[in-house]
């Protein structure tokens, strides 16, 4: 039975040209995290594997940085980066948990972080 929950940074906004940290946290389970995938819609950004370390998708290598922790840092943001991002946690023995973050990249200098929320 899957008892865990994924806490994410929720809806966030950032300035064009700036950077943002995408962060998820798995709680309420003793399951072992074996791998975390970061995806934008259906596009793979990066994978963090407990044994193999980080794989950054080649097309994002120059503007995606691993971390902090299991999170991901997006740099040199453009308006095209606006959209949904997913953290997919592979765990043992529970299976897969998915969290969602919505990022809005703003032209203006007014970019505030949204509230944190939980996805069961």
């Amino acid at each position: 039975m899957m008892t865990g929950t994924i806490e994410t940074t929720g809806n966030i906004s950032a300035e064009k040209g700036g950077s943002i940290i995408l962060q998820c946290h798995l709680s309420s389970t003793t399951a072992q995290v074996t791998q975390v995938n970061w995806e934008q819609q259906d596009q793979l950004l990066a994978i963090c594997n407990a044994d193999l370390g980080w794989h950054i998708s080649p097309s994002f290598k120059d503007r995606v940085a691993p971390g902090p922790g299991l999170g991901l840092t997006l740099q040199s943001l453009t308006v095209n980066d606006t959209g949904e991002y997913f953290c997919i946690y592979h765990t043992y023995p529970d299976g897969t948990y998915t969290g969602r973050i919505f990022l809005e990249v703003l032209e203006s200098s007014v970019a505030e972080h949204g509230a944190r929320f939980q996805i069961p």
Epitope: N49, L52, H55, I56, P58, K61
Partner: antibody
Framework: QVQLVQSGAEVKKPGASVKVSCKAS????????MYWVRQAPGQGLEWIAF????????TYAQKFQGKATLTVDTSISTAYMELSRLRSDDTAVYYC????????????WGQGTLVTVSS | DIQMTQSPSSLSASVGDRVTITCRAS??????LSWYQQKPGKAPKLLIY???SLPSGVPSRFSGSGSGTDFTLTISSLQPEDFATYYC?????????FGQGTKVEIK
């Protein structure tokens, strides 16, 4: 097109070292990891290690920790694998391979380098 | 370590046959499995990644399926150039390991 060209065959004595090179072309070298795999005569494939050409960080199979050393020279888009303390059972064809776009698989392979260890 | 077991170790088939090779992982690897083709004296070539995705240039007669521990490579209509040895490989942990290979021979 993407190409990996490896250095030529080597014959070494037990206890010696060998350094195999892998020259990449047709893509941005630092965007991909380079993997090394070996195949003993008549046998299957065995993964040795990979190196992130961007950061220079390496990940090894435990069996090859201290045996293989991976390096890259990004200025000439070339990866290297040095094997130390060679034994007769290190006789094999050694392949370099570019990592995949979506994980730790091997997308494009070099032609292979035969390393023969014999006294 | 995750062990990969292929079956059969060899098979004989004719041109036009449908051929199926299976690969079993000793624990769940989700869909992190790739397949390679190797001809004698040549380097392996990637056929399938992430269990079912075909790289560009690989003929559509090759297909992959499965997830978790059980995977299949299917050649829908065997061609003369398909006689080779096929290997599976997981890409889910260290060490990355390959199956022992399946040799497809001419009947």
């Amino acid at each position: 097109q993407v190409q990996l060209v490896q250095s030529g065959a080597e014959v070494k004595k037990p206890g010696a070292s060998v350094k195999v090179s892998c020259k990449a072309s047709g893509y941005t070298f630092t965007r991909y990891s380079m993997y090394w795999v070996r195949q003993a005569p008549g046998q299957g494939l065995e993964w040795i290690a990979f190196i992130d050409a961007y950061s220079g960080g390496s990940t090894y199979a435990q069996k090859f920790q201290g045996k293989a050393t991976l390096t890259v020279d990004t200025s000439i888009s070339t990866a290297y694998m040095e094997l130390s303390r060679l034994r007769s059972d290190d006789t094999a064809v050694y392949y370099c391979a570019r990592g995949g776009d979506y994980g730790w698989y091997l997308g494009v392979w070099g032609q292979g380098t035969l390393v023969t260890v014999s006294s | 370590d995750i062990q990969m077991t292929q079956s059969p170790s060899s098979l004989s088939a004719s041109v036009g046959d449908r051929v199926t090779i299976t690969c079993r992982a000793s624990q769940s690897i989700y869909s992190y499995l790739s397949w390679y083709q190797q001809k004698p004296g040549k380097a392996p070539k990637l056929l399938i990644y992430n269990a079912k995705s075909l790289p560009s240039g690989v003929p559509s007669r090759f297909s992959g399926s499965g997830s978790g521990t059980d995977f299949t490579l299917t050649i829908s209509s065997l061609q003369p150039e398909d006689f080779a040895t096929y290997y599976c490989q997981h890409h889910y942990g260290n060490p990355l390991t390959f199956g022992q290979g399946t040799k497809v021979e001419i009947k």
